[in-house]
Interface confidence: medium
């Protein structure tokens, strides 16, 4: 549970975080697991501990092994293990599986590829990005902060992407590379004018005075990821938040994706302790997106409670 695999290339910087998390103020001691020898904290050492981080500047193949970190809180010593493997640099272009970070998927609308582990390093923009060992060029590729954005993603954009950056430690620079696969989802999404599934137009909903009532506004907006879509309730043409009746609140339901792949949204209107005056209000279910707005109106009517004596 508290063991973590880390890997890197020889002559590159590698920084590993202790798998046992503690508060920033907690003392963290690092040891070579085999010898139980303490790892120094002095930065003049090639391998040194810095709080929750273990730094190899740069890494050597001989550094491979298991490292123990002990997070010392006031009372409790919590132990974690970092299983570190340093590999020799490959002469050819292929990046072996054991050097790959988790695969990410993208689509036409969402094509961010984050540079793995970069948050552990002291780096400055820009990042360099490579695909299958070729430097990425052209206006479709944008290196932004710690991720790469690909415009108008196509199936051919799938492949192995490597980010390269420089880690700076006390004025000394060290190279770091990290590679992950990118797959492209064939997502033929579209957007259409909102379709309200519930409530029906001019529906009359029966409610009991003094009881709670729920009204659900449900609408679908197209297929795939929707850029802008919303469902909401209005009371007499006013937003719920502006209406000022604390008994009546709206609450987002779950995003739904039906079996036919449509992207739908729910919004539940909760009326606590239904009162006579609630029957006089006009309840509007609104669904809107870039195509426009659709409105279905509901009114409440009194439901006569069952007479248990008759």
């Amino acid at each position: 549970k508290f063991s973590k695999q880390s890997w890197g290339l020889e002559n590159e910087a590698l920084i590993v975080r202790c798998p046992r998390q503690g508060k920033p103020s907690y003392t963290v001691d690092w040891y070579y697991s085999q010898t139980n020898k303490s790892i120094p904290t002095q930065e003049r050492n090639r391998v040194f501990a810095s709080g929750q981080l273990l730094k190899f500047l740069p890494a050597a193949v001989a550094d491979s092994g298991i490292y123990t970190c002990i997070v010392r809180s006031p009372t409790f010593n919590r132990t974690g293990y970092a299983n570190v493997t340093i590999y020799k640099k490959q002469s050819d272009c292929n990046v072996p599986d054991y050097l790959m970070y988790s695969t990410v998927s993208g689509s036409e609308k969402n094509s961010k590829i984050y540079c793995p582990t970069i948050d552990l390093y002291n780096w400055t923009a820009p990042l360099e990005w490579f695909k299958n060992c070729q430097a990425l060029q052209g206006s479709r590729y944008r290196a932004h902060k710690s991720f790469l954005v690909i415009d108008n993603v196509m199936t051919e954009d799938a492949g192995d992407y490597t980010c390269k950056f420089i880690h700076n430690e006390n004025g000394a620079n060290y190279s770091v590379t990290a590679t992950r696969s990118f797959t492209v989802k064939d997502e033929q999404g579209f957007s259409l004018f909102p379709v309200i599934g519930a409530p029906a137009q001019n529906e009359i909903k029966e409610v009991e005075i003094g009881k709670n009532a729920n009204l659900t506004c449900s609408a679908c907006f197209g297929k795939g990821t929707q850029f802008l879509a919303a469902v909401l309730w209005q009371l007499n043409g006013t937003k719920i938040t502006d209406f000022g009746e604390p008994r009546i609140q709206q609450e987002e339901g779950q995003n739904q994706s039906f079996s036919n792949g449509l992207a739908c949204l729910d919004m539940v209107l909760r009326i606590a302790d239904v009162k006579e005056e609630d029957l006089l209000l006009q309840y509007d279910c609104l669904a809107l997106n870039l195509h426009g707005l659709r409105r279905h109106t509901v009114r409440l009517s009194r439901k006569n409670p069952i007479d248990h004596h008759s």
């Epitope: 508060k23 010392r72 006031p74 409790f76």
Partner: antibody, heavy 118, light 112 residues
Framework: QVQLQQSGAELVRPGASVTLSCKAS????????MQWVKQTPVHGLEWIGA????????AYNQKFKGKATLTADKSSSTAYMELSSLTSEDSAVYYC???????????WGQGTSLTVSS | DVVMTQTAFSNPVTLGTSASISCRSS???????????LYWYLQKPGQSPQLLIY???NLASGVPDRFSSSGSGTDFTLRISRVEAEDVGVYYC?????????FGSGTKLEIK
């Protein structure tokens, strides 16, 4: 300013149980581990145990295992110590104390005096 | 358990002069990370203990710099450079190297 407010003095019969409380204010409750300390003229200061409100972890001095049970309620920022099967040996002043990594026993409550007598 | 040993009373001191209080541990309090887990507390009459020194030589916040502490892994000394009336009380050393945490029996600072 970190403050630990302990419950008032207790006079209880032998064999009974008692729960002492320690309400924290002026800081984030989960930022401090809560230690409990017993003080008597004979044995001086003795560490009973500790409770980590963030994780729920407890640690006890072997001497007080089975005697003391430490808990906490995050919602009210209050730590509790239950003492069971009380005898006259348990008569003492009990302190709660908040600890951070460097500052062990950094902040102390005012103490709760417990007298066990028939 | 680690035993912390203190003498019950200090030599009576005159206000404005310096005082020393000693403490000995039954094992070294030096951790492999280089920190010595020795703490000093003062309990003034009718009050709760208060932290003075942490990790052998560091002054806790709000503690006057008249207080200082030094020592090896097992022998420690708390020094008060110019004793004031408000310094009277019982001084405890404690170890936080290993469980159970243990305190010394306390040294009472007496004024001439």
């Amino acid at each position: 300013q970190v403050q630990l407010q302990q419950s008032g003095a207790e006079l209880v019969r032998p064999g009974a149980s008692v729960t002492l409380s320690c309400k924290a204010s002026g800081h984030i409750f989960t930022d401090y581990e809560m230690q409990w300390v017993k003080q008597t003229p004979v044995h001086g200061l003795e560490w009973i145990g500790a409770f980590d409100p963030e994780t729920g972890d407890t640690a006890y001095n072997q001497k007080f295992k089975g005697k003391a049970t430490l808990t906490a309620d995050k919602s009210s920022s209050t730590a509790y110590m239950e003492l069971s099967s009380l005898t006259s040996e348990d008569s003492a002043v009990y302190y709660c104390s908040g600890s951070t990594t460097d500052y062990y026993f950094a902040y102390w409550g005012q103490g709760t005096s417990l007298t066990v007598s028939s | 358990d680690v035993v912390m040993t203190q003498t019950a009373f200090s030599n009576p001191v005159t206000l404005g002069t310096s005082a020393s209080i000693s403490c000995r541990s039954s094992k070294s309090l030096l951790h492999s990370n280089g920190i010595i887990y020795l703490y000093w507390y003062l309990q003034k009459p009718g009050q709760s203990p208060q932290l003075l020194i942490y990790q052998m030589s560091n002054l806790a916040s709000g503690v006057p710099d008249r207080f200082s502490s030094s020592g090896s892994g097992t022998d420690f000394t708390l020094r008060i450079s110019r004793v004031e009336a408000e310094d009277v009380g019982v001084y405890y050393c404690a170890q936080n190297l290993e469980l159970p945490f243990t305190f010394g029996s306390g040294t009472k600072l007496e004024i001439k």
